[in-house]
Each structure stands twice: as structure tokens, then as C-alpha cells.
Amino acid sequence: AWELTILHTNDVHSRLEQTSEDSSKCVNASRCMGGVARLFTKVQQIRRAEPNVLLLDAGDQYQGTIWFTVYKGAEVAHFMNALRYDAMALGNHEFDNGVEGLIEPLLKEAKFPILSANIKAKGPLASQISGLYLPYKVLPVGDEVVGIVGYTSKETPFLSNPGTNLVFEDEITALQPEVDKLKTLNVNKIIALGHSGFEMDKLIAQKVRGVDVVVGGHSNTFLYTGNPPSKEVPAGKYPFIVTSDDGRKVPVVQAYAFGKYLGYLKIEFDERGNVISSHGNPILLNSSIPEDPSIKADINKWRIKLDNYST
């Protein structure tokens, strides 16, 4: 058996700094939560303790605070690179500043793959955006490989500003051939990472043959097994288990929003890539977890321009 730890975030919405418990501006620092400096501490702690770890983001890093207003996505690329994310799926809000506002600050600057299988570029944009985002990526993890396929809400044209040269296809229709392609490449451990909401996440788990795990976003869904550690009320257990049409038990996860929690899912695979077991819970990033001093110093450096902006 081979064990994989999936760390995941979604719908962070520009919460680079720590926030209050309700994800608004941090007032009493001793009671604040989240933020990339605290996230980094926890991620590094887990990376040090466990051998096979992936850090994934399921979209909507863009939009939500003055950080995005001022930096327009450059802050997302910089700090996600600093935390060494392994992959990200495109969310609807990544298109809020148009396709150019996605390409220049994020797609060209991210060191990690940015994914969506159901967004197809056409016309003059096709060559401009080619290779900047991908339908899937095969990631080496230790001596194994894991396939990550991305997806994005097909409602994005009504929710954001992707323009007329991007077509948002049905998620399940677009995902199946990409998963099939991964199977032909002998990739037998496949994660669907995307931003279409919990209902679609469950449908993908049910309908897309070959998907082993679904890591979602968009609906800000909080899942938890046991007594929840803060104010969020769980919509179900973590992971939420869906029985696929071909009889497999597929774990589906999401980690609320605003960087308040870090999703933590441990998956055990057999030698054929079947999920043997899955367990975990979102980790509340409260003040018991110190902010990493190096990332915090970087945040403070970037913060200067925001202070100038607000005055």
C-alpha cells in the first residue's frame, strides 16, 4: 500500500493576512486565524512529518480584500510560489479582471501548474494562452505518480469576465476523456481538483470513471468528522464518500473558505491505484499555530503598498 497526504485550500479570496474568526479584518491578533504565514507553518510541519504530500488549491484565490484590489493577482502567484503549491484549479473569480488579468499576473508567474479541463480557448486567444493552463498534470510524488485533472464552474461566463474566446464545457463531459488519457499513460491514481461546487463535486465522483478523489471549491462547503472546532456547521462528514456508478467509494472534500482551514486528507492506495482507505479533517488555522516569521516578514513588506493605498 502507498499513502498520500492531500493538503488543500479553496476560496481563499485574498485572505493573505490573518483574519478574525468570521474571516473579516484581524482586530485582536491573539484570536486571529488563517493567513499564508500561518498556513505555511502548518504545511511545513506536515511536509516534515509525512513522506508523500501534495498541496493543492481548488480555485478562487482572486477577489475579496484590498490585496487583490492593489496587486491584482501578483500577490497570489508570489505567495503560492512561496508556499510551494503543487497545483491549482481555476475558479470563476480568477477571470474577474478578464483573461489578461489572469494571464499576466498568475498564469505566467506561477511555478505550479494551473488546471482546467473544461475551459477551451478559441480564436486569437488559443495560441496566446496555449500551455499556460492545462487540462491535467502528472505529478511525481516520491517513487509514484499522481494525475491531477482540473475543472471550473461552467457558470463562469455569468459570474465573471472570461470574455468571448473561452468556452466553458460541461465538467463531466470534459473530464472523462482527460481521465481516460491519464489511464492510457499508466497513471492509476487520479485526483479531480476543481471549482464547481459541492453538488458537482459529488456528481464528478459518481460519474467520471477513474477519478479516485475529488477536491473541490466554490460552494464554501465545510465538512467535518467529529466535533467542529469553530463556528462553521458541517454539511457532512470529511471526507464525504460517494459511491460511483461503477461501485467505487470516492472521497470528496472541500475546506470551507478564506484560508481559515487547511484541508487534510490521507489516502491509502493499493498497488493497482485503488483507494483502500481515506480519512482526515480540515485543520483550523487558529492562533495556536504560529505565523512563519519569514513569510510574515514578506507579508509585511507587501503590506506597505496597501497602507499607502488606504491613506
Partner: antibody, heavy 121, light 107 residues
């Protein structure tokens, strides 16, 4: 067990070329970034080159850029370093080292035993 | 390029001593720092990665700490087999760079 074995070192005249090889075993070679690190006699360690796990990207320090080329053959589990326009200051023990499984810079967890390159007329 | 400065360049110590080696980066490197041990005529050996994580099989008397620009390697109780040269290395960004080394000799 996990092992890296370098070969191809020797004595070469300034301006000439040499190709080093590193045979890997005991791990999934195609999953790891691979590096060359050198050590001049009586000196410290100097990083020379990296090639990412899939061969998509290569990085070099200014001291060897344009003269050295790193490559890999994943089907043969072998790493190479092609060294052209060699200079006296390239004289060193050259180590092959294993990096990480991503596109981010990494440390080296496994090292070969090294192969000596002497550039002298 | 990020410069790595190690101190001291050499030190003399006795078996059982607590030994501390420092490494300073010319700019912040978060926790992307590794430590290596090298004995004469041998290849380097990985001791610590991510500033404080012990490589598998390395004795627990070795420990690392630090973040940002200042880092420390500590040997809590020096053993005869620990007499060697120690190097730090940053892997925050390319080009990867090493410290100049610290030679730990028998007093």
C-alpha cells in the same frame, strides 16, 4: 538500494570537451530532479546544474552557463553532463546528486561517489 | 545570487561537547536550507533539510533551527565520527548556493 555512480572523469586539455555520466538505481529515476555538484581540490561545494524530473527545465550558475549542458535519458536511468570549452578552474570532483520531485529548487538527499576531472595542459 | 556565509570556518572540540555552527543568507530564504556532512575523500551526506528536518537515518544529536536569514546546526554531544566538514545550502532559488564550510576538528 538507492545508488548513484558517476563515470567519465579524467585528464583533459583546456578548451577540450568531456562528458560525464551518472547511472541511477534503486528508485524511480524519472520522478526526480537531478543535479551536478563539484568540488575543486581543497575547496568547498559548488552547484553546477539541475535538470527537472521530466527534462522540461534546466538551470545553471553563471560560471558554467553556455559551456556545460545537463541532460538525462529516463529510459536508461542515466544523467549526463556535457562539458565544453573546459578551463583549469573546472578541475574538480564532480558529484551527481538526487533532488526533489517537483519544479521547485531542492536539496540533495542522495549523492554519488564522485568522478575527478582534471583540466591541464 | 544568494550568498551563504558560514561561521566559524573551523573549530576544535572534544568528544561530548555541544557544537554550534551558524549559516547566514544574504537575503531571506524562508526555511529552504539544508545541512551536509563531508568526511575527507568522501561524498557529502545529507543531514538536515527544510532547516530543521532530520534526514532519515541521521542520529538525533544533530538538529537544525532558524528561518529567514539566520540558521544553526547543533551537535548536542559530539561523537568521534562527527569530526568532518559541514556545509549549509540554500534552495530558495536558483542558482543553488553553499556556505564555505565549517571544519570540525579534534581538540
Amino acid at each position: 538500494q538507492v545508488q548513484l555512480v558517476e563515470s567519465g572523469g579524467g585528464v583533459v586539455q583546456p578548451g577540450r570537451s568531456l562528458r560525464l555520466s551518472c547511472a541511477a538505481s534503486g528508485f524511480t529515476f524519472s520522478n526526480y530532479g537531478m543535479h551536478w555538484v563539484r568540488q575543486a581540490p581543497g575547496k568547498g561545494l559548488e552547484w553546477v546544474a539541475v535538470i527537472l524530473y521530466d527534462g522540461s527545465n534546466k538551470y545553471y550558475p553563471d560560471s558554467v552557463k553556455g559551456r556545460f549542458t545537463i541532460s538525462r535519458d529516463n529510459s536508461k536511468n542515466t544523467l549526463y553532463l556535457q562539458m565544453n570549452s573546459l578551463r583549469a578552474e573546472d578541475t574538480a570532483v564532480y558529484y551527481c546528486a538526487r533532488g526533489g520531485s517537483s519544479w521547485y529548487p531542492d536539496s540533495f538527499d542522495i549523492w554519488g561517489q564522485g568522478t575527478m576531472v582534471t583540466v591541464s595542459s | 545570487d544568494i550568498q551563504m556565509t558560514q561561521s566559524p570556518s573551523s573549530l576544535s572540540a572534544s568528544v561530548g561537547d555541544r557544537v554550534t555552527i551558524t549559516c547566514r543568507a544574504s537575503q531571506g530564504i524562508s526555511s529552504w536550507l539544508a545541512w551536509y556532512q563531508q568526511k575527507p575523500e568522501k561524498a557529502p551526506k545529507s543531514l538536515i533539510y527544510a532547516a530543521s528536518s532530520l534526514q532519515s537515518g541521521v542520529p538525533s544529536r544533530f538538529s537544525g533551527s532558524g528561518s529567514g536569514t539566520d540558521f544553526t546546526l547543533t551537535i548536542s554531544s559530539l561523537q568521534p565520527e562527527d569530526f568532518a566538514t559541514y556545509y549549509c545550502q540554500q534552495y530558495n532559488s536558483y542558482p543553488l548556493t553553499f556556505g564555505g564550510g565549517t571544519k570540525v576538528e579534534i581538540k
